[in-house]
Amino acid sequence: LRLLDHRALVCSQPGLNCTVKNSTCLDDSWIHPRNLTPSSPKDLQIQLHFAHTQQGDLFPVAHIEWTLQTDASILYLEGAELSVLQLNTNERLCVRFEFLSKLRHHHRRWRFTFSHFVVDPDQEYEVTVHHLPKPIPDGDPNHQSKNFLVPDCEHARMKVTTPCMSSGSLWDPNITVETLEAHQLRVSFTLWNESTHYQILLTSFPHMENHSCFEHMHHIPAPRPEEFHQRSNVTLTLRNLKGCCRHQVQIQPFFSSCLNDCLRHSATVSCPEMPDTPEPIPDYMPLW
């Protein structure tokens, strides 16, 4: 978790002098509770936006937006703590809006936004906005949270972001798999424009079951430049096992930008349809 281009983080707006600060996610008001605390944020919204860095890279960011409730507690609002927790790693990053002037009611509802948390493809986050100071123990909570899932690199708009492109999202191998006679599979796919090796991972399953009955790995050496964007054809020999008929073919590239952590593509061959064999009709009728 990180912030995008830490340079120009702004939270000031007409009628409010405000600064954005790094936060330890443990505000002082936890340790030294105050008697009077503000109410919780209203209408917390999370959106996925895309932002360019100064270097021109494109990253997905969480756009966080919320409004204030129109009650008197606005007079005791000293700022807000924004927290983003990545659920699969428990990594948390916080920033603090510090209000340098008192808030006053005005003709429009106060609205705040922040769009600098960089998020990763296919990751889920818990986004929380805490008004400060935080409530006294047993006080009414003054935060709002939402769980936010970022689309993976298969998504059309995500595909062109820097983290997705780094993991090989622009490569479309267009895999085709056909079953040949004599227990063989022919796998065909389009090579990318990089001189790097590939691996084909074959996993076979019985019909309607999910434990594998055969596994095989096939190494494909790095193509020469004249072979870039050409089709590569590989014939794999299957184990002669009755019923081991559903095959998943996965192609793992080893691009320089992602090494052994590149996006994999797969294709599946289903078991052949079993024709319903009707009961044979006898060509004579027994008398008894």
Partner: nanobody, 127 residues
Framework: QVQLVESGGGLVQPGRSLRLSCAAS????????MHWVRQAPGKGLEWVSG????????DYADSVKGRFTISRDNAKNSLYLQMNSLRTEDTALYYC????????????????????WGQGTMVTVSS
């Protein structure tokens, strides 16, 4: 323009099934997560179920888990809600809702100001 049109509602007896459909137009349907939200007579809005752009993640409210199934067909720009074992408390106006942005939120749309609503389809469960 952007439009969501729900259909499939009606009067049904407890224990029976209904399938709601939502036809989307005017936006790139397979870019966005979608939700079903309902409003019982005289009550507030209740989130029912949500599905990501590629059906990779699906969530349900506890009140409908195990009975309702959300699905989508991106080729047909359509969202569905299969409702089985219906109860009287499922009586409500059912809305199809589009996320405002490309992300997905568990437990309801990422924005309380839902971007796009349909006109709703009424489901009445009564004996």
């Amino acid at each position: 323009q952007v439009q969501l049109v729900e259909s499939g509602g009606g009067l049904v007896q407890p224990g029976r099934s209904l399938r709601l459909s939502c036809a989307a137009s005017g936006f790139t349907f397979d870019d966005y997560a979608m939700h079903w939200v309902r409003q019982a007579p005289g009550k507030g809005l209740e989130w029912v179920s949500g599905i990501t752009w590629n059906s990779g993640r699906i969530d349900y409210a506890d009140s409908v888990k195990g009975r309702f199934t959300i699905s989508r067909d991106n080729a047909k720009n359509s969202l569905y809600l299969q409702m089985n074992s219906l109860r009287t408390e499922d009586t409500a106006l059912y809305y199809c809702v589009k996320e405002r942005s490309l992300g997905y939120c568990r437990g309801g749309p990422c924005s309380d100001a839902f971007d796009i609503w349909g006109q709703g389809t009424m489901v009445t469960v009564s004996s």
